[in-house]
């Protein structure tokens, strides 16, 4: 059962796992949610009746029954983890805490103009978990405007004390705001020889990499595969760090793989969601329950529905035994990973999908692409919306993309002559325009946010956000697309598609069925040669065939240029402008979304 509200002056008795320090009860709840075992917590607020050494303590708790006895205690605030809830969860914490000093290892001290600058510095520093900034009113002259970057083993402060005229806050890496490079490369036959901060068991290098990504201290990892010569180290995932933030060296070792934390692009990759099944593999751990199940998929469902289950092993039924049902072993451990992994025993293992909601919805796998043809099928582009105007009569105006449960990203030029958001309607989950009738449900638009530097499509900044009046419930036919990561600027997208209901040639009409076309990206240099009379800036991206023939056209504006990378779809471009449609040596020009990620996040995450 999902309980979101906090219980004031209430303490949960017993069940303690560990104690951390957090600046608020709200953040204590987030820490509990991300902890592999925590189901409940008790936070102690500052209070004259409470010993100051206990202020800001956040006690993480577990219980077999999923609840604990409640005791009245002044200044105690208790609650439940969001593990029990189905809604999207984020570790992003933009709050600034006034007059609080969050203690940790102060590894960097520098002058900053403001707390915001200090927070940005922390976000763009590979080691930084949180910071404390001494304001210009700070009593000690030599400490004024000093920005202290801090880290700890857990990513949370080792203590929090009251201190006048300072402010503290957390790194915004988990808000997708870091400019740090995202090193997605996995290095086969490679060991990184740096200090291990932790080790866990993992079934493959990808799970090892995801564990590294959400571990607060892990910057890179080495994984020993099941063929590793030393039996005791098989399936071992070593989580590593170094002072420089990069491995000091690489050593060649057969059957080992190494890679990096993807912390700075974790919003556009699955990190908590280990959805694969591992055949002929047994996961060992503390047994929670043994249940009969028809298949390994059914076993995974059982694990996902049991809040304390972290992973499972399914043993298929022996012929005609137990009505064809196998045994489903639901398991857990202190860190969420198996304590040992065994091969060759016939089991099928996997992880709970309960934690998938801690990943961005946009990373969810969608239906496989339909190859060939130009007409899309239902659910193929679930982020694509059709934006209608009702004035003077109702018609399709532009395309757009769902990027959040209340947000559509589109082109600014779509709103030329649109006086009010009241005349706009957003239809999602639509394949054919003919589906849209009087009674078809739509989302009203609360606000149109046009980039304040926009003048005309050809000069750039052709980007706009629509804030919807109500939230979108994600389904297979309507769900968000990931924004590209700032740390991924060097990625080459090779699987890009433009979609829309626009014209199929210059003089045409709006199409009934959503059209799709696979289009290669073109370098900005090449694009500039094709548009000598225009300035193709780095905030634009071009796509098209040299010979023409496939392109976006009138009516596709504002729609997505969607590119698949590492099994995840990214909104790389917004259909903006071009010379004619599908003309030879005239690529389409799109708004380069990665260059506007800060702007998008600033507008959509504004409190």
């Amino acid at each position: 059962e999902c309980v979101t509200q906090l219980l004031k002056d209430t303490c949960f008795e017993g069940g303690d796992i560990t104690t951390v320090f957090t600046p608020s009860a709200k953040y204590c709840q987030v820490v509990c949610t991300y902890h592999p075992r925590c189901l409940l917590f008790t936070f102690t607020a500052e209070s004259p009746s409470e010993d100051p050494t206990r202020w800001f303590t956040c006690v993480l708790k577990d219980s077999v029954t999923e609840t604990l006895p409640r005791v009245n205690r002044t200044a105690a605030i208790s609650g439940y983890s969001f593990k029990q809830c189905s809604h999207q969860i984020s570790a992003c914490n933009k709050d600034i805490y006034v007059d609080l000093d969050m203690k940790g290892i102060n590894y960097n001290s520098s002058v900053a103009k403001s707390a915001q600058e200090c927070q940005e510095r922390c976000t763009d520093d590979v080691h930084c978990h949180f910071f404390t900034y001494a304001t210009r009113q700070f009593p000690s002259l030599e400490h004024r405007n000093i920005c202290l970057l801090k880290h700890t083993q857990t990513g949370t402060p080792t203590r929090i004390t009251k201190l006048d005229k300072v402010v503290s806050g957390f790194s915004l890496k988990s808000c997708a705001l870091s400019n740090l490079a995202c090193i997605r490369d996995i290095f086969p036959n490679t060991v990184f020889a740096d200090s291990n901060i932790d080790s866990v068991m993992a079934p493959d290098a990808f799970v090892c990499g995801r564990i590294c990504t959400h571990h607060p201290g892990c910057l890179f990892f080495t994984f020993f595969s099941q063929e590793w010569p030393k039996e005791s180290q098989r399936n071992l995932c070593l989580l590593k760090t170094s002072e420089s933030g990069l491995p000091s060296t690489r050593i060649k070792k057969s059957k080992a793989l190494s890679g990096f934390s993807l912390q700075s692009c974790r919003h556009s990759i699955p990190v908590f969601c280990h959805s694969s099944f591992y055949h002929d593999t047994d996961f060992l751990g503390e047994e929670l329950d043994i249940v009969a199940a028809k298949s390994h998929e059914a076993c995974q469902k059982l694990c996902t529905n049991a809040v304390r289950c972290q992973f499972f092993t399914y043993t298929p039924a022996q012929a005609s035994c137990n009505e064809g049902k196998g045994k489903c072993y639901l398991k857990l451990s202190s860190n969420g990973s198996p304590t040992k992994i065994l091969h060759g025993r016939g089991g099928i293992s996997g992880y709970t999908l309960r934690l998938c909601k801690m990943d961005n919805e946009c990373t969810t796998k969608i239906k496989p692409r339909i190859v060939g043809g130009t007409a899309s099928v239902r659910g193929e582009w679930p982020w694509q919306v059709t934006l209608h105007t009702t004035s003077p009569t109702q018609r399709h105006l532009c395309g757009g993309s769902i990027i959040g449960n209340q947000w559509i990203l589109t082109a600014a030029h779509c709103f030329y002559g649109v006086e009010s958001p009241k005349i706009l309607r957003v239809y999602s989950g639509i394949l054919n325009q003919s589906e849209i009738k009087e009674d078809t449900s739509f989302f009203g638009v609360q606000e149109i946010i046009i980039h304040d530097q926009y003048k005309m499509a050809e000069s750039g900044y052709d980007i706009a956000l629509l804030k919807l009046e109500t939230t979108v419930n994600y389904t297979d036919s309507q769900r968000p697309i990931c924004l590209p990561s700032k740390g991924d600027r060097n990625v080459i997208y090779t699987d890009c598609w433009v979609t829309g209901w626009g014209y199929r040639k210059l003089r045409d009409k709006i199409q009934n069925t959503l059209q799709k076309a696979k289009i290669p990206l073109v370098t900005n240099e090449e694009c500039q040669k094709r548009y000598r009379g225009h300035k193709i800036t780095h905030k634009m991206i071009c796509a098209g065939y040299r010979e023409g023939g496939k392109d976006a056209c009138k009516g596709d504006s504002g729609g997505p240029l969607s590119c698949k990378h590492n099994e995840v779809w990214h909104l790389v471009g917004i259909t903006s402008w071009g010379e004619g449609c599908a003309q030879r040596e005239r690529p389409g020009v799109y708004t380069n979304v990665v260059e506007y990620v800060d702007w998008i996040l600033e507008k959509t995450q504004a409190v």
Epitope: A181, I183, R184, D185, R250, V491
Partner: antibody
Framework: EVQLLESGGGLVQPGGSLRLSCAAS????????MAWVRQAPGKGLEWVSS????????LYADSVKGRFTISRDNSKNTLYLQMNSLRAEDTAVYYC???????????WGQGTLVTVSS | DIQMTQSPSSVSASVGDRVTITCRAS??????LAWYQQKPGKAPKLLIY???TLQSGVPSRFSGSGSGTDFTLTINSLQPEDFATYYC?????????FGQGTRLEIK
Amino acid sequence: EVQLLESGGGLVQPGGSLRLSCAASGFTFSDYEMAWVRQAPGKGLEWVSSIVPSGGWTLYADSVKGRFTISRDNSKNTLYLQMNSLRAEDTAVYYCATWGDSWGFDFWGQGTLVTVSS
Amino acid sequence: DIQMTQSPSSVSASVGDRVTITCRASQGISSWLAWYQQKPGKAPKLLIYDASTLQSGVPSRFSGSGSGTDFTLTINSLQPEDFATYYCQQADSFPIAFGQGTRLEIK
């Protein structure tokens, strides 16, 4: 067919700078780790620097650390070596090469000569 | 850092001869060693990696052996096109290091 074509070499004074480029074709450049290897006149081979496919991690020989910067532009299939504070001992033919899973330099360019002299 | 030492620094042989070049690492490098051939005015060419695995397209008269610190490159039945300089390279860890080279010349 894999092709690597270096350019940008020439004569430069000690303390000066030079930027080498290596244009790649015939393979998926963005999938490969790349490197620069140099050879002083009449001498052996010396590894200079490497860069991973994403460009996010670079490694350098101690002899060039802090003076040389390796980079790549995957959209242009091009590898670069920015050389600053050049010394006489940096005089060499500079080769660009692909670095394979075998931990060997699989393919090499024809090289570009850098001469540092006053 | 690992240092590589090749011997001899030069060797004279005739077409049809069998030639052996050795390479020693300053510390154990398992079998992580590569061999290259370089002709005057040309770029080096990878011959062998992992001490004994022939790179595709390399004639079978070339072979490599060894592990730990001592390695050899053997050329059976020398052909005219084999006269060149040969380099070994440790592929155990960064920084990558080459041997100083062995010049194979016609007797």
